[in-house]
Interface confidence: low
Amino acid sequence: MMTGTIETTGNISAEKGGSIILQCHLSSTTAQVTQVNWEQQDQLLAICNADLGWHISPSFKDRVAPGPGLGLTLQSLTVNDTGEYFCIYHTYPDGTYTGRIFLEVLESSVAEHGARFQIP
């Protein structure tokens, strides 16, 4: 039985040319996370494997950076980056959990960043 839940940064916006952090959080389960995939619609952006570490898809290596944690940093944003992003948690024994984030890249400087980092 899958008891876990995925929390995400939700719907977020950022300025064209800027950067944004995509983040998901799997909670309420003791299942072991074996791999996290980050996908944009049907394209694979990155994989973080528990044993092998990070792999960034070659076509995104210039604009996608790993972390922090299991998150993903997108930089040099363009309007074409607007759309849905998915974090896919592969776990044992639960199976697969998927979280959705919608990113809107704005031309103006009024973008509100959804992911804010506080000093610990």
């Epitope: 983040q23 959080h25 799997l26 909670s27 072991q32 996370v33 996290v36 973080c48 528990a50 570490g53 990070w54 960034i56 290596k61 790993p66 972390g67 922090p68 944690g69 299991l70 998150g71």
Partner: nanobody, 115 residues
Framework: EVQLVESGGGLVQPGGSLRLSCAAS??????MGWFRQAPGKEREWVAS???????WYADSVKGRFTISADNSKNTAYLQMNSLKPEDTAVYYC???????????WGQGTLVTVSS
Amino acid sequence: EVQLVESGGGLVQPGGSLRLSCAASGRTFSFMGWFRQAPGKEREWVASVLRGGYTWYADSVKGRFTISADNSKNTAYLQMNSLKPEDTAVYYCTTDRGYNWNYDWGQGTLVTVSS
């Protein structure tokens, strides 16, 4: 327990250089990275490095900053050249702390660029 300890910050004149270090203990990491936070602003990503050596940089520091890692020492470095006043911030080291939400931050090291 994972510990991240940054060092190397300080006061430097515009155009000058600094080298930050982040020593990690407690486990082996897939990647290490640097973020920074200027007063009154959000924490922003600066650079990341994988253990395999691949590096990434924010556009604002490309060509001026170089991130590297010494895997044998579990230490990451950030060489900062041609520093500008807008680089003034507290610089934080981070890494992947296993496979959960609670990644680790260091305590930060202050970099001040001023004449």
